[in-house]
Interface confidence: low
């Protein structure tokens, strides 16, 4: 998602299960640290971004015609896992310790 | 990038190589359809925007904390190489058949 | 009121076993996690192993493949069998209870037991 | 595995005295950090878990604050039965493990 004048860069985000309606299946943990990847993608776009090449010609589009084409966006570029315990099909507590996909681990500019 | 209406899709962008000033090392072609990601990432996420579980998460946030957090955004999910034919170090002309990373295939919500 | 009774410490040489026992009581015993925390004479607390309410197990890298954590919820005892003991394993050992079915933190400890490894 | 370092190791402070012990995880281990209280030949107390949660029965005078990989246990006026060792311990991910020890002495 994208933020103000900040560059690209991971923020915390505190997600309570009962907030997004997943406290009905998920036991544990109550809330979790999602992050967020917040800032803009400037240019020139920095290595820590890890920028593709499209990331870097839509950058330099942008600069040309800013009103044709947007700026890249800072998104997740790498996921890590959390462990949870949740209610399977049969309502059993049952504890996954790599729930893929949940939490940001990096940003970067796409 | 992130749009206005319409729900997360692939739009053509044409780059003309002289506009971004690559046209200095790339003979050919002047020009290709880089493709965009342009479109808002809205509830429910649709499986054709191939959502992560992070951008699920983010999504239900900013349903209830829309000032809060951001929608997740629509960016290039795999990308295409084009051919090119380029001045090398020594300045002579070499062809690249995949240079990788140029063109969006796929779009969806991170 | 819930209450943890530690037992089965005492003297055993290198190489020897023991299975240490913990009595719960006062609180439904098969929805926590118990753990078994040391202290060596003079030192800190370690965490030694825990078994979930669902079942799973994990232990500190330096008791694996020679301590066992199991419980037995019909009559609400938490147990942990002592292979192959060293020097230093010597030291009290505590019963505790998670406040919760998963990892978390240690609400109620026992009065400890002491395992002494010396021959 | 996730350390946990405590500081200071050791403090003399006098009885009224506001006090703070600092505790830093290696690793985000977000608000699941806990505090305990050991006094000689007793069990360890559970004082505060989850950073800041003041657990039943536990006086107002301790405090928790923190989130992340910095956490600090806060006594702010300290009593004669406050003179203990206190030891952090995080709950976000097994292992668990424990900081040090921060014993605290009379002045």
């Known amino acids: 998602s994208t933020g103000a004048s900040s560059h690209c860069q991971k923020t915390s985000l505190r997600v309570n299960f009962e907030d997004i309606g997943w406290d009905s299946w998920i036991i544990a943990p109550k809330e979790y640290d999602a992050y967020e990847c917040k800032g803009g993608c400037f240019f020139p776009l920095a290595d820590d971004v890890t920028p593709t090449k499209h990331a870097i010609v839509q950058t330099l589009v942008h600069l040309k015609f800013p009103t044709k084409v947007g700026k890249a966006c800072c998104v997740p570029t790498k996921l890590s896992p959390i462990s949870i315990l949740y209610k399977d099909d049969m309502g059993v507590p049952t504890l996954k310790y790599h729930y893929e996909g949940m939490s940001v681990a990096e940003c970067g500019c796409r | 990038s992130t749009g206005a209406s319409s729900h997360c899709q692939k739009t053509s962008l044409r780059v003309n190589f002289e506009d971004i000033g690559w046209d200095s090392w790339i003979i050919a072609p002047k020009e290709y359809d880089a493709y965009e990601c342009k479109g808002g990432c809205f509830f429910p996420l649709a499986d054709d925007v191939t959502p992560t579980k992070h951008a699920i998460v983010q999504t239900l946030v900013h349903l209830k904390f829309p000032t809060k957090v951001g929608k997740a955004c629509c960016v290039p999910t795999k990308l295409s190489p084009i051919s090119i034919l380029y001045k090398d170090d020594m300045g002579v002309p070499t062809l690249k058949y995949h240079y990788e990373g140029m063109s969006v295939a796929e779009c969806g919500c991170r | 009121q819930v209450q943890l009774l530690e037992s089965g410490g005492g003297l055993v040489q290198p190489g020897g076993s023991l299975r240490l026992s913990c009595a719960a009581s006062?609180?439904?015993?098969?929805?926590?996690?118990m753990s078994w925390v040391r202290q060596a004479p003079g030192k800190g607390l370690e965490w030694v192993s825990i078994?979930?309410?669902?079942?799973?197990?994990h232990y500190a890298d330096s008791v694996k493949g020679r301590f066992t954590i199991s419980r037995d919820n019909s009559k609400n005892t938490l147990y942990l069998q002592m292979n192959s003991l060293r020097a230093e394993d010597t030291a009290v050992y505590y019963c505790?209870?998670?406040?919760?079915?998963?990892?978390?933190?240690?609400?109620?400890w026992g009065q400890g037991t002491l395992v002494t490894v010396s021959s | 595995d996730i350390q946990m370092t405590q500081s200071p190791s050791s403090l003399s402070a006098s009885v009224g005295d506001r006090v703070t012990i600092t505790c830093r995880a290696s690793?985000?281990?977000?608000?699941?950090l806990n505090w305990y209280q050991q006094k000689p030949g007793k069990a360890p107390k559970l004082l505060i878990y989850d950073a800041s949660n003041l657990q039943s029965g536990v006086p107002s005078r301790f405090s928790g604050s923190g989130s992340g990989t910095d956490f600090t246990l806060t006594i702010s006026s300290l009593q004669p039965e406050d003179f203990a060792t206190y030891y952090c311990?995080?709950?976000?991910?097994?292992?668990?493990?424990f900081g040090q020890g921060t014993k605290v002495e009379i002045k």
């Open positions: 505790a209870r998670g406040s919760y079915i998963i990892w978390s933190a240690l609400d109620y």
């Open positions: 311990q995080q709950s976000d991910t097994s292992p668990l493990t």
């Open positions: 690793q985000d281990i977000r608000s699941y």
């Open positions: 078994t979930l309410g669902t079942g799973h197990t």
């Open positions: 006062g609180f439904t015993f098969s929805s926590y996690a």
